[in-house]
């Protein structure tokens, strides 16, 4: 939802946790803002409490669950409304019906590991977390390396078009640091995003044998 | 402060036509969504019918869908509803409400409402 410079953004990580950003340039700081889901076919309710992460946003956490608990279906509607205190009472801000299977951000890929490292390539792997089930195999990854010297904004994106949770990269410079992030996202949803990138990898490769072509 | 008043309510044979409207006048340009709300005394105040900003979505309570039809000119900062084939259970008082959220529902409830007109009778006899 969107009007002027106020905007209400929410995000499903597919199992228990409905995240939110709430901004509007020149609302007061210290105002005391919430999240409450209503879902339309279920019995709990929820609330957060905004904090702020800027100037003039705020976030927060819907916890629906445990971490791992399947909380919501593609059939679902929760209706979101941000209040704000003002006075005596709580002011309704911002409202959306919310489809959470439209909406989606997974967690970031953990585990990530060095499986195979040689002079030239290296095989790692991670796992995804907190996904649902319903996704089955319809999910796709993209990936970076930063080498030395670059930025990760300059490291170009390996794009993975299935669920593959390892890569082999090539064509890397011998007994040299690298940096690794893979980051997921579902192929359901009209407006789902890709996750935050993992924590980065970090791998060196083996130094190349002496006397030996490289 | 928006200040909402109400006209067209009155007395109509069940099977008749109503047509309320409700003029916003002062912060008009904070308004967002507008609905209707119909009140019988010694109940809760129930929503009828709602109409975004543009006036691209609306939602209405089953039992008035297909007779009742809510409209919004933005031009004359007016929000009508249009009531027919009434019946005795839609005696109530109308009143008009306002909201500066941002967004849209189709699960409207009163709290989600900042400013409210005084309301107009609408009777129908049997």
């Known amino acids: 939802a969107v009007n002027g410079t106020s905007q209400f953004t929410c995000f499903y990580n597919s199992r228990a946790n409905i995240s939110c950003v709430w901004s509007q340039d020149g609302a007061l700081q210290d105002t005391s803002c919430q999240v409450h889901a209503w879902p339309d076919r279920r019995r709990w309710n929820q609330t957060c409490e905004l904090l702020p992460v800027s100037q003039a946003s705020w976030a927060c956490n819907l916890i629906l669950g445990a971490p791992d608990s399947q909380k919501l279906t593609t059939v679902d509607i929760v209706t979101l409304r941000v209040l704000c205190r003002e006075g005596v009472r709580w002011r309704v801000m911002a409202i959306q019906d919310f489809k959470p299977f439209e909406n989606l951000r997974l967690m970031a890929p953990i585990s990530l590991q060095v499986v195979h490292v040689e002079t030239h390539r290296c095989n790692i792997s991670w796992e995804i977390s907190q996904a649902s089930h319903y996704f089955e195999r319809h999910l796709e990854f993209e990936a970076r390396t930063l080498s030395p010297g670059h930025t990760w904004e300059e490291a170009p994106l390996l794009t993975l078009k299935q669920k593959q949770e390892w890569i082999c990269l090539e064509t890397l410079t011998p007994d040299t640091q690298y940096e690794f992030q893979v980051r997921v996202k579902p192929l359901q949803g009209e407006f789902t995003t890709w996750s935050p990138w993992s924590q980065p990898l970090a791998f060196r490769t083996k130094p190349a044998a002496l006397g030996k072509d490289t | 402060e928006v200040q909402l008043v109400e006209s067209g309510g009155g007395l109509v044979q069940a099977g008749g036509s109503l047509r309320l409207s409700c003029a916003a006048s002062?912060?008009?340009?904070?308004?967002?969504?507008m609905a209707w709300f119909r009140q019988v005394p010694g109940m809760e105040r129930e929503l009828v019918a709602a109409?975004?900003?543009?006036?691209?979505?609306?939602v209405y309570r089953d039992s008035v869908k297909g007779r009742f039809t809510i409209s919004r000119d933005n031009s004359k900062n007016t929000v009508y509803l249009q009531m027919n084939t009434l019946k005795p259970e839609d005696t109530a008082i109308y009143v008009c409400?306002?909201?500066?959220?941002?967004?849209?529902?189709?699960?409207?409830?009163?709290?989600?409402?900042?400013?409210w007109g005084q309301g107009t009778q609408v009777t129908v006899s049997s």
């Open positions: 409400a306002a909201t500066r959220a941002i967004g849209w529902t189709a699960r409207w409830i009163t709290t989600d409402f900042d400013f």
């Open positions: 002062g912060s008009i340009f904070s308004i967002n969504a």
């Open positions: 109409i975004s900003r543009d006036g691209g979505a609306s």
